[in-house]
Interface confidence: medium
């Protein structure tokens, strides 16, 4: 299944309501408005695939379609990270990868997409209706998350068709900077368009499959209620999840990801901002001014960091870009 957050569709002005201004006069404002909406709306896609060879083995692929520099990717299951979801893997461009069972292999596929293979055996194996979520933290867009799952009727070996229920979330800390300025500009542009008496207010019509209306909705205060509208988490079969996930995770083990930030609009003030924080029993992303600390609950890794090189035969340098140039 490939669930993609759609850019809101713009409804063009009705031909009968052209008014005093000629059609060409409106081209620039509409182009600007289109750019505003699309530029302010990074997209995250999630694809969940059940392998034909191993019926209980899953491959989750996630990608970020924004233009910013990705500073952290978190993959979770059972719901969004911080909303009852349990972390499967954390990928950081400089510090590396950490993963926990049943994750078998997490890897960067490109500069902006990752994949995760899940083990298909034992109590911790996923099942078809499990929800998998990918959260991308980037600068300047902030933090964006999308979720997806395989419908129970999916044929093994096939990706499910796009579902209409991805979660797309921007953490406030990440978008109040550059994205906030962009949003203000877009709102102002809308205001200018409204002032033309002979023009109806431009209608922003969300795409049918999009949970996200105009940009402002992305950081609506009630993220939990937003999420509830989009993904029916009540249908998750919790028996597919390991029982150990509901218990407090032991401390110790890999240290770096417990205090990993996602990129916020504000730079950390100094080393103190990155001091390790107590690890809660459940995974959560805590938004603070200096950054977003990944506080997914620590568990003893079964397979350790699942580190696999970029698939390009030329090696990592083939992935040159904002993160990869030596």
């Amino acid at each position: 299944m490939r669930t993609e957050a759609q850019v809101p569709a713009l409804q063009p002005p009705e031909p009968g309501l052209e008014g005093a201004m000629g059609h060409r006069t409106l081209v620039l404002p509409w182009v600007l408005l289109t750019l505003c909406v699309t530029a302010g709306t990074p997209e995250v896609w999630v694809q969940v695939r059940m392998e034909a060879t191993e019926l209980s083995s899953f491959t989750i692929r996630c990608g970020f379609l924004g233009s910013g520099s990705i500073s952290l990717v978190t993959v979770s299951w059972g719901g969004p990270n911080g909303a009852g979801g349990t972390t499967l893997a954390v990928l950081h461009p400089e510090r590396g990868i950490r993963q926990w069972a049943p994750a078998r292999q997490a890897r960067w596929e490109t500069q902006s997409s990752i994949s995760l293979i899940l083990e298909g055996s034992g109590a911790s194996s996923p099942c078809a209706n499990t929800t998998f979520c990918c959260k991308f933290a980037s600068f300047p867009e902030g933090s964006w998350e999308a979720c997806g799952s395989l419908p129970p009727s999916s044929d093994p070996g096939l990706s499910a068709p796009p579902t209409p229920a991805p979660i797309l979330r921007a953490d406030l800390a990440g978008i109040l900077g550059v994205s906030g300025v962009l949003l203000f500009g877009c709102v102002y542009l809308l205001h200018l368009l409204r002032r033309h008496k002979h023009r109806p207010a431009p209608r922003l019509q969300p795409s049918r499959t999009s949970p996200q209306a105009p940009r402002a909705r992305a950081w609506a205060p009630s993220q939990a209620s937003q999420a509830a509208l989009h993904v029916p988490y009540a249908t998750i079969n919790t028996s597919c999840r390991p029982a150990t996930l509901d218990t407090a995770h032991p401390h110790g083990g890999p240290s770096w990801w417990a205090s990993l930030p996602t990129h916020a609009a504000h730079r950390p003030q100094g080393p103190a901002a990155w001091a390790s924080t107590p690890i809660p029993a459940r995974g959560s992303f805590v938004s603070v001014e200096n950054g977003l600390y990944a506080q997914a609950g620590e568990r003893p890794p079964h397979t350790g960091p699942g580190l696999t090189l970029f698939p390009d035969p030329r090696g990592p340098r083939a992935m040159e870009g904002p993160l990869g140039v030596r």
Epitope: P93, E94, G96, I97, L307, L309
Partner: antibody
Framework: EVQLVESGGGLVQPGRSLRLSCTAS????????MSWFRQAPGKGLEWVGF??????????EYTASVKGRFTISRDGSKSIAYLQMNSLKTEDTAVYYC?????????????WGQGTTVTVSS | DIQMTQSPSSLSASVGDRVTITCRAS??????LNWYQQKPGKAPKLLIY???SLQSGVPSRFSGSGSGTDFTLTISSLQPEDFATYYC????????FGGGTKVEIK
């Protein structure tokens, strides 16, 4: 030419402090994480810690044995990385190296300084 | 932390010999392993990154292989300047090194 030059090493008493500098040249300093390593006499290499690149907010991380005592920082305007060492112990005696990277964690540390010797002794 | 175990700790070889050094990780690190060469009184030099990618400027007689937990550094034909100590290092923080393999002249 891409180059790293360490300085600031010397003889210091246990419990005292010392600050090492790593001056970078020949590359865009802010684009790279900077790492510190050490090597005790006749021993192998040990990672001390690192400070992330500008793109990742300059986050720091340390090996367990120095956490709380050592602090890594960077001055982008001067292209210098620092290793502030407090509460020094005799077991901190080593040659300290700074290294460029990792730019991405898969790449390794591709440029190293010549090293500076720190001797902690009473 | 991930432990890296190198073997042998030392070996004696002659110019022209094929030399193989192994490194084992305490848990899977996929292909994220680097190899360094260090000569007495000098800083380490990166030879191989990501298990098998040759660092720019490093002679092609050096090669790396392996994935998961077992890795190998091979010098196809040992040259006089290759007598040194070699270290493996895994790439996710906290970074850890193998104990080193000293290649000496037979």
């Amino acid at each position: 030419e891409v180059q790293l030059v360490e300085s600031g090493g010397g003889l210091v008493q246990p419990g005292r402090s010392l600050r090492l500098s790593c001056t970078a040249s020949g590359f865009t300093f802010g684009d790279y994480a900077m790492s510190w390593f050490r090597q005790a006499p006749g021993k192998g290499l040990e990672w001390v810690g690192f400070i992330g690149s500008k793109a990742y907010g300059g986050t720091t991380e340390y090996t367990a044995s120095v956490k709380g005592r050592f602090t890594i920082s960077r001055d982008g305007s001067k292209s210098i990385a620092y290793l502030q060492m407090n509460s020094l112990k005799t077991e901190d005696t080593a040659v300290y190296y700074c290294a460029r990277g990792p730019r991405r964690y898969t790449y390794g540390m591709d440029v190293w300084g010549q090293g500076t010797t720190v001797t902690v002794s009473s | 932390d991930i432990q890296m175990t190198q073997s042998p700790s030392s070996l004696s070889a002659s110019v022209g010999d094929r030399v193989t050094i192994t490194c084992r990780a305490s848990q899977s690190i996929s292909s994220y392993l680097n190899w360094y060469q260090q000569k007495p009184g000098k800083a380490p030099k990166l030879l191989i990154y990501a298990a098998s990618s040759l660092q720019s400027g490093v002679p092609s007689r050096f090669s790396g292989s392996g994935s998961g937990t077992d890795f190998t550094l091979t010098i196809s034909s040992l040259q006089p300047e290759d007598f040194a100590t070699y270290y493996c290092q895994q790439s996710s923080t906290p970074l850890t090194f193998g104990g080193g393999t000293k290649v000496e002249i037979k």
